[in-house]
């Protein structure tokens, strides 16, 4: 095989671009969303964020994430998603494991679906850059 | 050895379609992106667009968007481009391409098919 | 769309030269650029992705470097089975796009 070692191809320069560029396309589907007005935000939905026995960016729950803002891509055709899918994908290993996503089936619900994990992604991506910034502080003392 | 194997050469009327095949051995990971390039005769490589086979995701190139449908057939690791709407223009080799690990993401495309040369003549 | 813009279109050297070929993203993709050599009538070969990491079998003469948006092939000593054409792309998002390509010839 001609898979190369992981220090390679993880410049913490990129990283940290590719999680600032996820940040500010969250904010941007976040802003989107909330448009829809009347929608509250669902306590019977999480999104998977940071993992706290990983190092950054090891520790951002990426294959997870992406199965989530698929899943709102098929609800509600948000053509930022690809855009977010792509770099995530910078981060997702080739042999990650999948993630099943059960889908609110009521109209309502699923406006709530994807106002709840819009909301807890751009949570997730100021935590995530948050944790990659203090990560490279600690290196670096 | 991984190898991608496409569809022979094609003739074809202006106005028709023609559909490329490419399919992929010595591969068994389903996270990557595929794409799709072509080649104009004397003219430099044009992205056209990709494809995500595990789960039919596609991105295209504004150019070609409403003449090109890529897709993919898990079942056979085959992926098709088929370019609608034919002109003497899109006389061209067709090329798939593929990268190697580890990441979902591209950084390179490692593996590329023979190239299909489709000629649009009337 | 991001555009990457490489020059010189076209080159003559002589064997053993140095030569070097630059491709400019419109904007920041990081490391995230590949270099392809196509010779005549041939498919295209990965020689360098990620901006700098050279693919397997490649000769060590190829190297790849980046300097903010300005990335650069360099052929350190100019072989004649190097006469072909080089094109960047960039894989930062899509479209995928690709330098318009750079033929080198040996004078």
């Known amino acids: 095989s001609h898979t190369l070692p992981v220090r390679l191809l993880r410049p913490s320069d990129d990283v940290q671009k590719i999680v600032e560029e996820l940040q500010s396309l969250s904010k941007m589907l976040l802003k989107d969303v909330e448009e829809e007005k009347g929608v509250l935000v669902s306590q019977n939905y999480t999104l998977p964020c940071l993992s706290p026995d990983a190092q950054p960016p090891n520790n951002i729950h990426s294959p997870a994430i992406r199965a989530y803002l698929k899943t709102i891509r098929q609800l509600d055709n948000k053509s930022v998603i690809d855009e977010i899918i792509e770099h995530l994908d910078k981060l997702i290993f080739q042999d990650a494991p999948e993630t099943n996503i059960s889908v609110p089936t009521d109209t309502h619900e699923c406006k709530r679906f994807i106002l709840t994990i819009s909301q807890q992604f751009s949570e997730c991506m100021d935590l995530a850059l948050k944790s990659l910034t203090s990560g490279a502080q600690q290196a670096t003392t | 050895q991984v190898q991608l194997v496409q569809s022979g050469a094609e003739v074809k009327k202006p106005g028709s379609s023609v559909k490329v095949s490419c399919k992929a051995s010595?591969?068994?990971?389903?996270?990557?992106?595929m794409q799709w390039v072509r080649q104009a005769p004397g003219q430099g490589l044009e992205w056209m667009g990709a494809i995500y086979p595990g789960e039919g995701d596609t991105r295209y190139s504004q150019k070609f968007k409403g003449r090109v449908t890529i897709t993919a057939d898990k079942s056979t690791s085959t992926a098709y481009m088929e370019l609608s709407s034919l002109r003497s223009e899109d006389t061209a080799v067709y090329y798939c391409a593929f990268p190697e690990g580890p990441y979902a993401a591209p950084y390179g495309m490692h593996y590329w098919g023979q190239g299909t040369t489709v000629t649009v003549s009337s | 769309a991001i555009q990457m813009t490489q020059s010189p279109s076209s080159l003559s050297a002589s064997v053993g030269d140095r030569v070097t070929i630059t491709c400019r993203a419109s904007?920041?993709?990081?490391?995230?650029l590949a270099w392809y050599q196509q010779k005549p009538g041939k498919v295209p070969k990965l020689l360098i992705y990620?901006?700098?990491t050279s693919a397997s079998g490649v000769p060590s003469r190829f190297s790849g470097s980046r300097s903010g948006t300005d990335y650069t092939l360099t052929i350190s000593s100019l072989q004649p089975e190097d006469v072909a054409t080089y094109y960047c792309?960039?894989?930062?998002?899509?479209?995928?796009?690709f330098g318009g390509g750079t033929k080198v010839e040996i004078k």
């Open positions: 990620y901006a700098k």
């Open positions: 010595g591969y068994t990971r389903t996270r990557y992106w």
């Open positions: 792309q960039h894989f930062w998002s899509t479209p995928w796009t």
């Open positions: 904007r920041n993709i990081g490391n995230y």
